[in-house]
């Protein structure tokens, strides 16, 4: 079953996928696709990187992650209730039916208005398999959970936090990592 | 000491082709990828296309596309650009830069162009 | 292509002062992969940051870069004789690599 992650309308949402490469600058090609993974390539393909670069993308598709280091995670900007949906990583390892294909699930929920948001940090048990991303309007300010008004520096430190935590590795182990070499 | 050196300026009539060299020394050079970007007279600069030193792989710019060629001697440690069909809005200073790819340990995956060659000047004039 | 806009075009600044320097992605930068660039006549380029913010081996610590998907900024927090140049904005994670039509920092 797939693992689901949630955005408001008019938000920006994250799609985790993380692999090691073999060595610094030793890249693999990934798809990113709407809808699950196919056999082989991805379906209605919305990015797609070769052994350097992001080479096809479409808008509103991007990856804030260090690519080049195997965060291939999907920001998608502005989501709207059609953004809802299964969407496949899949990390094109070389080799016959060596792919690893990683199945997520967006779910999209109609924005609402809420009071001025609380400064806590509150990661729930549900953290790994539920995972909004908020922002501030389209490639602005994300954050992760209820954590509100924080950068995508500090985001980025939160992110290497977790991904050295208990909660990343549930996260990993849940389908969205994979090591090559 | 890192450096990249160039071949001498160039000049060049309508519709011929040049070649310009770029010599590698004081790094592991099949380690890192090679880059050519251009700069016309009083102009900003062009990024034209890499060459993945190790194993030879390339990727140009659409603009460039079926006109530009980038090898490498790795026995030499230098990379080539070939740019054929040269046209006068070809008349530029054509660099080398290095990409360095930076251990996984180390903070960003990539270091953009930290080394570039000292420039060719390329002419194309009848 | 991703297009990088940069502003002003030119800056006209004292010794000593501070130069801010704005560039603009048409689209985000994948990966942050954003690079500054400094270029003196009849010299070639020289990396400044890359990675949007890391400075890069021997740039004085004056050079600091910030921002995240399309807007980027480049600082020098007390600009020096020698920081009188043209700074050039590049991202280089998306194919083709672009890079921004530059900002002349002159002296007033």
């Known amino acids: 079953s797939e693992v689901e992650y949630r955005a408001e309308v008019g938000q920006n949402a994250y799609l985790p996928c993380f692999y090691t490469p073999a060595a610094p600058g030793n890249l693999v090609p990934v798809c990113w696709g709407k809808g699950a993974c196919p056999v082989f390539e991805c379906g209605n393909v919305v990015l797609r990187t070769d052994e350097r670069d992001v080479n096809y993308w479409t808008s509103r598709y991007w990856l804030n992650g260090d690519f080049r280091k195997g965060d291939v995670s999907l920001t998608i900007e502005n989501v709207t209730l059609a953004d809802s949906g299964i969407y496949c990583c899949r990390i094109q390892i070389p080799g016959i039916m060596n792919d690893e294909k990683f199945n997520l699930k967006l779910v999209i929920k109609p924005a609402k208005v809420t009071p001025a948001p609380t400064r806590q940090r509150d990661f729930t048990a549900a953290f790994p398999r539920m995972l909004t991303t908020r922002g501030h309007g389209p490639a602005e300010t994300q954050t992760l959970g209820s954590l509100p008004d924080i950068n995508l520096t500090q985001i980025s430190t939160l992110a290497n936090e977790l991904r050295d935590s208990r909660l990343a590795n549930d996260l990993r182990d849940s389908g969205a990592t994979i090591r090559i070499g | 000491e890192v450096q990249l050196v160039q071949s001498g300026a160039e000049v060049k009539k309508p519709g011929a082709s040049v070649k310009v060299s770029c010599k590698a020394s004081g790094y592991t050079f099949t380690s890192y990828y090679m880059h050519w970007v251009r700069q016309a007279p009083g102009q900003g600069l062009e990024w034209m296309g890499w060459i993945n030193a190790g194993n030879g792989n390339t990727k140009y710019s659409q603009k460039f596309q079926g006109r530009v060629t980038i090898t490498r001697d790795t026995s030499a440690s230098t990379a080539y650009m070939e740019l054929s069909s040269l046209r006068s809005e070809d008349t530029a200073v054509y660099y080398c830069?290095?990409?360095?790819?930076?251990?996984?340990?180390?903070?960003?995956?990539?270091?953009?162009?930290?080394?570039w060659g000292q420039g060719t000047m390329v002419t194309v004039s009848s | 292509e991703i297009v990088l806009t940069q502003s002003p075009g030119t800056l006209s600044l004292s010794p000593g002062e501070r130069a801010t320097l704005s560039c603009r992605a048409s689209q985000s930068v994948s990966g942050n992969y954003l690079a500054w660039y400094q270029q003196k006549p009849g010299q070639a380029p020289r990396l400044l940051i890359y990675g949007a913010s890391s400075r890069a081996t021997g740039i004085p610590d004056r050079f600091s870069g910030s921002g995240s998907g399309t807007d980027f900024t480049l600082t020098i927090s007390r600009l020096e004789p020698e920081d009188f140049a043209v700074y050039y904005c590049?991202?280089?994670?998306?194919?083709?690599?672009?890079f921004g039509g530059g900002t002349k920092v002159e002296i007033k």
């Open positions: 830069a290095r990409d360095h790819v930076l251990p996984l340990y180390y903070g960003s995956g990539s270091y953009a162009f930290d080394i």
């Open positions: 590049q991202q280089y994670g998306s194919s083709p690599y672009t």
